[in-house]
Interface confidence: low
């Protein structure tokens, strides 16, 4: 048969994953030893899987010795649970749905998981996991999600001079490693470069036929979907005009699985007050109430009046909900017709991913 390509020694990756799994652990807290041992066992498993490729590699051998030393020091047993797995699961461990959404807790109710939705589009408009809707400034790099399973960060840039409105031109998504299911995978998109692959060139995570994580290109260079079966999570990334939009569905128990130090997450807590574009009654609704707010940086851009913007948005979004209002806001702020498509696709993404139909159309509230 064909010669196999030599695989790369991945000890650095194993070590990085171990550091990522243990950096947040508090040695004074209850359960530290058991969590540390879980991570050590995952580290050991990772080094075993890369052992052939690392033959003769000093870093690899010192890591193996280091693991052995740590196992002894911490009184860790060689057998037992590893990080991010549930040892009692008898179904497919890399399919979140196959074990009722229960993860890292022995037993418990096998209730179907409660899903949460978060979306970001336009100027940018944020729909949080709590179905709160905000228009934010958030210029520069900001985390939407930063939990034990997934990190999503966006970079926003000013859309027009003299306005605090920004839009997203870069998205970075880190699907964190889970023993036996997938190595850590990083996805990055920038305006005019929306790849259908992770940064390492692969299109899936997981061994062999177990596609625990995969990317689907729906529209070349314009729309990709990421399906992470192992964490029951779906992410849509689109480019409309010059900017990117994001829609994410994730099980509640995973979305809320984060450390105190990870509480700057726009999807969880919304925008910081200082980053809200708001005049106290909701800037978007103020515009549509035919009175532009006093403190706002919104200005009717040449080419759109409130009437023409409303007409154009109404064609795509017959329900005058927050998506319609955001569309009008963006047209008046930027004069860029692509924001109509962004608001429309954001609503389509809600309908595809949001678990509760009665909450698809929401109406304005202030920051």
């Amino acid at each position: 048969g064909d010669c196999q390509q030599p695989t790369q020694c991945r000890i650095q990756k194993c070590t990085t994953d171990f550091v990522a799994l243990t950096a947040h652990l508090n040695s004074a807290a209850d359960g530290f030893d058991s969590e540390f041992c879980k991570a050590l066992r995952a580290y050991a498993g990772c080094t075993q899987r890369t052992s052939k490729a690392c033959r003769g590699n000093l870093v690899y051998h010192s890591a193996v010795l280091g693991i052995s030393d740590l196992m002894s020091q911490r009184n860790c047993s060689k057998d037992g649970p590893t990080s991010s797995t549930n040892p009692e699961v008898t179904h497919d461990p890399c399919n979140y749905h196959s074990h009722g959404g229960v993860r890292e807790h022995g037993g418990g109710d096998q209730r179907p998981p409660n899903y949460l939705f978060c979306g970001l589009f336009g100027d940018p408009h944020l729909r949080t996991f709590k179905d709160h809707f905000q228009t934010c400034k958030v210029e520069g790099a900001w985390p939407l999600i930063d939990n034990n399973y997934l990190s999503v960060q966006v970079t926003n840039v000013p859309v027009v001079p003299g306005s605090s409105a920004t839009a997203t031109n870069k998205v970075t998504i880190i699907f964190k490693a889970q023993h036996e299911c997938t190595d850590q995978k990083v996805y990055q998109a920038v305006t005019d470069d929306l790849p259908a692959a992770f940064v390492d060139g692969t299109t899936s995570g997981g061994d062999g036929d177990v596609k625990s994580l995969h990317i689907v290109e729906k529209e070349s260079g314009r729309y990709v979907e990421m399906h992470a079966r192992y964490i029951g999570t779906t992410v849509f990334v689109r480019q409309l005009g010059r900017y990117l939009t994001l829609a994410i569905r994730m099980p509640e128990d995973l979305a809320m699985s984060y450390e105190e130090s990870q509480d700057l997450q726009l999807c969880v807590n919304g925008c910081p007050m200082s980053e809200c574009i708001d005049d106290g009654q909701g800037q978007v609704s103020a515009i549509l109430g035919h009175s532009l707010p006093h403190t706002t940086s919104v200005q009717a851009w040449p080419g759109y009046t409130l009437e023409t913007a409303s007409t154009q948005c109404h064609e795509k979004m017959p329900v005058k909900d927050i998506y319609f209002q955001s569309c009008v806001f963006d047209l008046l702020t930027t004069g860029d017709a692509n924001f109509t498509a962004a608001a429309h696709s954001a609503l389509e993404d809600v309908e595809a991913l949001h678990p509760r139909k009665e909450r698809w159309h929401i109406f304005p509230s202030s920051c």
Partner: antibody, heavy 117, light 106 residues
Amino acid sequence: QVQLQQSGTELVKPGSSVKISCKASGDTFTSDYMHWIRQQPGSGLEWIGWIYPGNGNTKYNQKFDGKATLTADKSSSTAYLQLSLLTSEDYAVYFCARQTEGYFDYWGQGVMVTVSS
Amino acid sequence: DIQMTQSPSHLSASVGDRVTLSCKVSQNIYKYLNWYQQKLGEAPKLLIYYTSFLQTGIPSRFSGSGSGTDYTLTISSLQPEDVATYFCQKYYSGWTFGGGTKLELK
């Protein structure tokens, strides 16, 4: 592979201005933030500001307001730092660096600016 | 302003030593912290980003950890080529570098 090539050493007189350049190659210049960082002799690093070449937007460390001006030329993929009303306090190495997420992954080699009469 | 304090400012260690450098911040920066290495006459080089992620091509003897206000860079087994100054840098609520730790061989 991204490379940031900075202009050469500058010897300037007090009270004058200097404009140093940072030419980017191998990546999309317009879609990344370009930062400038100062390092005085034997000292730490100080952030001056950034420019987003795609639209020319800038943000400065308050300390450098009125001292530093950042510009960019998209056609040549070059970012510029202009320092005005130079004094001996401005004697330093000035680096440009590209921002990815929250970190600076590529740096120029640095430009030494010496202020002397 | 958020203050960043690196300690020690100077450190001498032997080849093979485990070396730990500290970066303390005056308020929570939510792990938004990077580490750089700067050798004499060179530009800084990224080692660790977002507290604990190893930058591509950096040896695995470098690792980072921490949260809240206390952050650490560890060199598990010091090598001669690690002689340099190490800077931490935050990117939460502004871009600021620590004062640096100069690492030398005994």
